[in-house]
């Protein structure tokens, strides 16, 4: 809900020669005073004096950190990722104890062949980054490994990664069904036991711009919201112009308070403006003074 203009107002002369009605009550939180040397500064809302000026905390700005910004920087990651924990059973290689040692020549050769095979399997998936073997164990060789996926951050990144994980499942199921041993021989790069293929776990990057926006807005969290422009999220208050949620104050100035965004209406030489959006103009009556 938007606050109405306080009854008690102070008229300030604007740069255009008109006046702006501003609240005479202090809507900010209690004053914090910090002293450096013999310089005393009133830095409000948790701001601190650095010897020259107030250093304000988000979402405040101004000489005394008394004003609320119209937009807050939020920085989604450039890329987002998913990690799939998979198990496959390779039948074309027999297990030896040396495979347990990740620095052995056996492990390095197995890793090379397995990586080549998986790169072929997942070659059509744009989000595919690679595989990482986490453990090898007996049976012929049970391969516990991670499939790594990555994509550029967009608002739909979760859908993109979810789709990619589904394609990974389809492709690994297909290859482990088709590339199987015949008479104890494998004619493919690797052969598999069809029943040994399992997806253990899927972890997807969690990033919520709305959550970051609300956290940074602190006590104004209910009044800041996220809007997208060119797939980039912006954390804005209704006082930020140019967005769908922007508040149109017509003949006035938008200002944030702890009750939300409100319009402070101007008074010109000819009109008073009022209303929630400063769109109701009342013409002043003219009194002529003779000298």
């Amino acid at each position: 809900p938007l606050a109405t203009i306080p009854v008690s107002t102070t008229s300030l002369t604007s740069s255009e020669g008109s006046t702006i009605s501003t609240p005479s009550v202090d809507i900010s939180t209690p004053v914090t005073t910090s002293i450096v040397g013999d310089q005393c500064s009133r830095c409000k809302n948790g701001g601190f004096w650095d010897g020259l000026k107030c250093q304000c905390l988000t979402p405040y700005y101004g000489e005394s950190c008394e004003e609320v910004v119209n937009s807050i920087d939020i920085a989604p990651p450039e890329t987002v990722s998913a990690q799939m924990e998979l198990t496959v059973t390779v039948t074309s290689v027999k297990f030896t104890d040396e495979l347990k040692n990740h620095s052995s020549q056996e492990f390095r050769e197995f890793n090379k062949t397995f990586t080549e095979q998986m790169n072929i399997v997942y070659s059509g998936i744009p989000e595919y980054v690679g595989v990482n073997i986490t453990n090898l164990r007996l049976g012929s060789v049970v391969v516990e490994h991670d499939v790594l996926l990555r994509t550029k951050y967009t608002p739909e990144y979760k859908t993109a990664l979810d789709n990619a994980t589904e394609v990974v499942k389809q492709k690994i199921t297909k290859v482990t069904t088709e590339q199987i041993m015949t008479n104890d021989n494998c004619s493919a790069l690797m052969c598999f036991n069809t029943t040994g293929t399992q997806v253990q776990n899927i972890t997807v990057t969690q990033y919520d711009p709305v959550e970051e926006c609300r956290q940074k807005a602190e006590e104004y969290e209910d009044y800041f919201l996220v809007e997208y422009r060119d797939q980039k999220p912006y954390c804005i208050s209704p006082c930020e112009s140019g967005f769908n949620a922007s508040k149109n104050c017509n003949h006035g100035k938008c200002q944030m308070s702890q009750n939300g965004a409100r319009c402070l209406c101007v008074t010109t030489e000819t009109h008073w403006y009022s209303g929630e959006d400063c769109n109701q103009g009342t013409q002043k009556s003219h009194h002529h003074h003779h000298h």
């Epitope: 039948t91 074309s92 290689v93 027999k94 030896t96 040396e98 020549q105 056996e106 050769e109 197995f110 090379k112 062949t113 080549e116 041993m181 104890d184 021989n185 494998c186 004619s187 493919a188 790069l189 690797m190 052969c191």
Partner: nanobody, 123 residues
Framework: EVQLVESGGGVVQPGGSLRLSCAAS????????WGWFRQAPGKEREAVAL???????FYADSVKGRFTISRDNSKNTLYLQMNSLRAEDTAVYYC?????????????????WGQGTMVTVSS
Amino acid sequence: EVQLVESGGGVVQPGGSLRLSCAASGFTFSRGSWGWFRQAPGKEREAVALISSDGWTFYADSVKGRFTISRDNSKNTLYLQMNSLRAEDTAVYYCAASVLVLRTLNPKAWHHWGQGTMVTVSS
């Protein structure tokens, strides 16, 4: 570093015999897998005879009963005894090795290769 050096190739008449050798170094010869592959002009490399440390052996259908793979661990050497040679056996023969105990005929799964020795069967 693993090094494989083949020898024993040459020109032989149909029905004749040859014995190929592959000397290995930088490798524990008693473990892993060893094999002979061949590549005829304009064709893909194919598995001829393979052997693994656990006793597994493979022979291509076209050489069964004519070729024999063996190894001498004390000499770190792999052999291919080729009898009753035919014109279609003409190819470059490659020795291959892996520290893994393999069951695969696919050359891409084999990591170490010799430079090859030419076998020509011609009258």
